[in-house]
């Protein structure tokens, strides 16, 4: 073969273009846009196209793009045509994986590992710098040492204890010492050195329809910060729920849908069906979010090609607060919520 | 402006190995291929490979194939191309270019690599 | 591979002349085609993509046409700065191929 790509795991086919009938160009000049802009659906960024000419409703994850129809920048995505190679006319709207990290003024990709100093293994997930210590000195001596000392050898980075009463030090109980530190290895001094640490999970980043949340952790064999990701679907898009609002009420806190359906990625279909709940929306300023959730996995099953399962956003429960903004304002998500006094229906 | 800025001119002896850079700013390096290209003296263009950077997938042409190497560096929006057991017949300057639909736009200055004992 | 064969492989012509090139490629690369423009010690330059999208910023004398196999890349009107080399390049399929160029003289 005159190409060997390295396999990638999930390729967008795209739609073909009308091949010889029309040109497959995306923006045309002089611009030519409609009188008025369009109403986005909630959530979707009204911004100017990739032609730089008109006012259009920004591309959401997942959905198809062209250098016209561009990602919604607010959300951090933007078109990954690596499906359309070598023609890149046509891609997919995709997560920007993280942002980095400036440490000591030295920027930092988001997923790089690196060390500030000698004594310390650091990795940038997301804006945010996480280190673990390469300095997992053993415990201090044993009983038989009453005065230990942590002090700096000449040369060496990290600190050593010493026993300022060496000359009474037992042979036996050195010869036990040095092969019960040997025997304890690195792993576990590194694992008696981790405090567990979890962030929440960051707010959904679309507010209808599939987004991403994520959040860091260190609970993991290594210790390490480590990114996590769920999908996440707030509510849906395409279903009105201002009209299952019971007569006299303001507010929808839940929505379910009647009807048990299977969940859809990039094409690929859930190996079962689930009847999800999902928040629901008020008529006036308050906006609904999870507060009872958990996470799920589900399995995907693809027409071509193998499976695979991803982390789900499972919603149990949801309240209507009163710290909201425009719905198309993404960072109304960052609002930090009111005490639950103000949840109301 | 998106622009593309390439490493210095380089000279090799047959069978060493060289590696050019190709520096990324004014766009997101991460969101599009970079591809290579060269030209040798008085001759025309000939496509070498393309890599991803944000995933780190490579293709290269069959020519190529086993002694050329592309990767990337995001931190520095860096991208690199590794050509070994060079012979007298690589000497040509090198481009990279960013994959844009249906072409490539735009693309770096180029990097003269002379192989000569 | 598919083979891109550009003919003539050199013109003279004046200014103010106007000049077609033509591309064929072996075999049906519906409208995957590129122009560039490349001038001595330079890096090449895109003018057209898709057979017949004009690149921003580049003059409209220049324009392209075709599908399938055959495609022309025009000047109306020829500039003393269009004097350079022409290449064709087909996106169409990997591995991506280039015609061996047009060199566009002054007469």
């Known amino acids: 073969t005159a190409l060997s790509p390295t396999p990638t795991t999930m390729t967008f086919t795209p739609a073909p273009l009308e091949e010889t009938t029309t040109r497959p160009e995306f923006c045309k000049w002089p611009c030519e846009c409609p009188q008025s802009p369009p109403r986005c659906p909630l959530g979707v960024s009204l911004i100017t196209d990739g032609c730089e000419c008109c006012k259009i409703c920004a591309q959401q994850l997942g959905d198809n793009c062209t250098e016209a129809a561009i990602c919604d920048p607010h959300r951090g995505l933007y078109c990954d045509y690596s499906g359309d190679r070598p023609r890149y006319a046509i891609g997919v709207c995709a997560q920007v994986v993280g942002v980095g990290c400036v440490l000591d003024g030295v920027r930092y990709t988001n997923g790089e590992s690196f060390q500030p100093n000698c004594r310390y293994n650091c990795t940038c997930i997301d804006g945010t710098v996480g280190c673990t210590p390469l300095c997992l000195s053993p415990r201090p001596p044993r009983l038989w040492c009453r005065q230990p000392r942590h002090v700096r050898v000449p040369g060496q980075c990290c600190e050593q204890w010493v026993c300022d009463d060496d000359a009474r030090r037992p042979r036996q109980t050195a010869l036990l010492d040095t092969r019960a530190f040997a025997a304890s290895g690195a792993v576990e001094q590194r694992y008696e050195n981790c405090i567990a640490y979890t962030s929440p999970w960051s707010p959904c980043s679309t507010t209808c329809g599939l987004g991403i949340s994520t959040r860091i952790s260190n609970v993991n064999a290594r210790c390490w910060p480590e990114q996590e990701s769920r999908l996440c679907n707030l509510r849906p898009c395409d279903v009105d729920i201002q009209l299952h609002i019971k007569a006299g009420k303001k507010c929808l806190a839940v929505y379910q849908p009647e009807e048990a359906t299977n969940f859809t990625l990039a094409g690929c279909v859930s190996t079962r069906t689930y009847r999800p709940k999902y928040c629901g929306v008020c008529t006036d300023n308050r906006c609904c979010i999870p507060y009872k959730s958990k996470t799920i996995s589900v399995d995907f099953q693809c027409p071509e090609g193998p499976g695979f399962s991803r982390q789900v956003l499972w919603i149990n429960a949801c309240f209507c607060n009163l710290s909201c903004r425009n719905p198309n304002d993404i960072f109304a998500d960052l609002e930090s919520y009111p005490d639950f006094e103000e949840i109301a229906n | 402006e998106v622009q593309l800025v390439q490493s210095g001119a380089d000279v090799k002896k047959p069978g060493a190995s060289v590696k050019v850079s190709c520096q990324a700013s004014?766009?997101?390096?991460?969101?599009?291929?970079i591809h290579w290209m060269r030209q040798a003296p008085g001759q025309g263009l000939e496509w070498m490979g393309w890599i991803n950077p944000n995933s780190g997938n490579t293709g290269y042409a069959e020519k190529f194939q086993g002694r050329v190497a592309m990767t990337s560096h995001t931190s520095t929006s860096t991208v690199y191309m590794e050509l070994s057991r060079l012979t007298s017949e690589d000497t040509a300057v090198y481009y990279c270019a960013r994959g844009a639909m249906g072409g490539f736009d735009p693309w770096g200055q180029g990097t003269l690599v002379t192989v000569s004992s | 591979d598919i083979q891109m064969t550009q003919s003539p492989s050199s013109v003279s012509a004046s200014v103010g002349d106007r000049v077609t090139i033509t591309c064929r490629a072996s075999?049906?690369?519906?409208?995957?085609l590129a122009w560039y423009q490349q001038k001595p010690g330079k890096a090449p330059k895109l003018l057209i993509y898709a057979a017949s999208t004009l690149q921003s910023g580049v003059p409209s004398r220049f324009s392209g046409s075709g599908s399938g196999t055959d495609f022309t890349l025009t000047i109306s009107s020829l500039q003393p700065e269009d004097f350079a080399t022409y290449y064709c390049?087909?996106?169409?399929?990997?591995?991506?191929?280039f015609g061996q160029g047009t060199r566009l003289e002054i007469k």
């Open positions: 075999q049906d690369i519906s409208r995957w």
């Open positions: 004014g766009y997101t390096l991460t969101s599009y291929d």
């Open positions: 390049q087909q996106a169409n399929t990997f591995p991506i191929t």
